[in-house]
Interface confidence: low
Amino acid sequence: QEFLLRVEPQNPVLSAGGSLFVNCSTDCPSSEKIALETSLSKELVASGMGWAAFNLSNVTGNSRILCSVYCNGSQITGSSNITVYGLPERVELAPLPPWQPVGQNFTLRCQVEGGSPRTSLTVVLLRWEEELSRQPAVEEPAEVTATVLASRDDHGAPFSCRTELDMQPQGLGLFVNTSAPRQLRTFVLPVTPPRLVAPRFLEVETSWPVDCTLDGLFPASEAQVYLALGDQMLNATVMNHGDTLTATATATARADQEGAREIVCNVTLGGERREARENLTVFSFLGPIVNLSEPTAHEGSTVTVSCMAGARVQVTLDGVPAAAPGQTAQLQLNATESDDGRSFFCSATLEVDGEFLHRNSSVQLRVLYGPKIDRATCPQHLKWKDKTRHVLQCQARGNPYPELRCLKEGSSREVPVGIPFFVNVTHNGTYQCQASSSRGKYTLVVVMDIEAFSSH
């Protein structure tokens, strides 16, 4: 008769490091000791006629256990295969590129350490909850990769790696482990350089707006802009509108920046840079400054008029050019009455990179001269009718401007000058018209002949 040795449970599945209660039993009517043959840590819990119970502890790997017993002079055996399952110790998605260009492939790489049985372990790469790749875990550590074409929609998207240990056929369910997500940052940086709008010339200590624009940028808000005049960084205001970035700054030239300079605009995104440069000439245009040796001259004195400007500036004073750029233009004159109030004009011309820039300045000369009464404006003999209105049209000149008074000889009677007045016979007589100032007096005799009013 053939007897059996049963091992229970048959082909169990348990979690790594766990314990297992094993029962060996036989229908052989033998009192022989039943032995459990295994390399695992074992402990006999109880035994009886034809049976023995053992406890296996710290089961870390797959194992085949064997029970054996002597029965009627022979040995019978029974076996069971233990399958150990364990969740991965590490599920890690490799770091993503700091920035990924849209339209280019990047690799998702997931490393899985541990996890058994490997035949039941699957690695899934995810974007949000969308499966990108599903592959079995093979080596130790298992490495699973997927190539992904980066799109705008991926900007800010979380990528993760999930392991699925499928123990459902064994009635244990599906065990899921997920890595920490990693966020992708995608970008678009056009190959074209930014558009840089800047002045060709910039005068020292003056300001001018500078604009730098780049279209087709994504995400525009993440881009960094560097605007500079030479080595002087400009304080830029950056605006984003959709995929367009505009940086505006005010360039102010310093005296030490005179000469050929560059305005630079750098737009950096995703570790890449686009640059635009424009040439600019910083110039200094001093003057023109017109000077009088005596702003207020005495009649007959010599006055020097000079006009100067900065280096490389050509000046022309009242049509007379200076000998060379950067030199002073000068003229001399004997001050006369006719020069009083005369304006001297100076024009300055500076050539900057083939362009001519012009500036003008003027100065007015004052000449001090004694009082005069112009005979042409002051008739010496007046014939007026009694009881009529007239104006004594006399004009004096001089610098300082003289006071003009007409007094009747032999009396203190004064007639107004330049103002209409009512004439009567008492006005008849000779008048001394005197212009006086701090520079002297000038007298002109005016005779008034008043014709009496005839009643018929």
Epitope: R90, A94, P95, L96, P98, E113
Partner: antibody
């Protein structure tokens, strides 16, 4: 087997720069981050920074931020550490070390490169 | 940055003695790594994730701790254990090491 082999000892003058190399073998170079650690004579370990050779991403100890540059050449599986504006206090043994993951730490170290800064 | 303070800085022990050294963090860390270094040699990984022994490390070594307080213990000191031990964290940049505990043979 994993190996990290560093370049030989260097003697430099103050103000100069030094570039130390670390050639890796026995594993996939792009998978593991490479760290640089230095040790002044008779002193402890001081972390300088690391590189992820897969992305060329680097992070540095703020103390060396403006003077250290860590690079990697994946075609030769070699990492480099360049330290500029050297001063006498930079005299130290410089190590490269692989980060094997949280379950391992800095699991493999180079043999070290002695850099001496002296006028 | 997280500062790791090791104590004592220097200690000596006789063979067979139990040895404990500590590593205190200025703020809480998840786990600590320990490295052993002997003169004119590169550091060797010794204990990872606070309490796991690296490959080839004798079982007389153990690591424990949590939060901001960690320790390395040698149950029975042996001559070959004389070395400097460094603790290390990487919860945040910069990665930092302790100043080391030098263990001498008495």
């Amino acid at each position: 087997q994993v190996q990290l082999v560093q370049s030989g000892a260097e003697v430099k003058k103050p103000g100069a720069s030094v570039k130390v190399s670390c050639k890796a073998s026995g594993y996939t170079f792009t998978v593991y981050w490479m760290h640089w650690v230095r040790q002044a004579p008779g002193q402890g370990l001081e972390w300088m920074g690391y590189i992820n050779p897969n992305t060329d991403y680097t992070e540095y100890n703020q103390r060396f931020q403006d003077r250290v540059t860590i690079t990697a050449d994946t075609s030769t599986s070699t990492a480099y550490m360049e330290l500029s504006s050297l001063r006498s206090e930079d005299t130290a043994v410089y190590y490269c070390a692989r980060w094997g993951g949280n379950s391992y730490g800095l699991d493999y170290w180079g043999q070290g490169t002695l850099v001496t800064v002296s006028s | 940055q997280i500062v790791l303070t090791q104590s004592p800085a220097l200690m000596s022990a006789s063979p067979g003695e139990k040895v404990t050294m500590t590593c205190s963090a200025s703020s809480s860390v998840s786990y600590i790594y320990w490295y052993q270094q002997k003169p004119r040699s590169s550091p060797k990984p010794w204990i990872y994730l606070t309490s796991n022994l690296a490959s080839g490390v004798p079982a007389r070594f153990s690591g424990s701790g949590s939060g901001a307080s960690y320790s390395l213990t040698i149950s029975i000191m042996e001559a070959e254990d004389a070395a400097t031990y460094y603790c290390q964290q990487w919860k945040s940049i910069p990665l930092t090491f302790g100043a080391g505990t030098k263990l001498e043979l008495k």
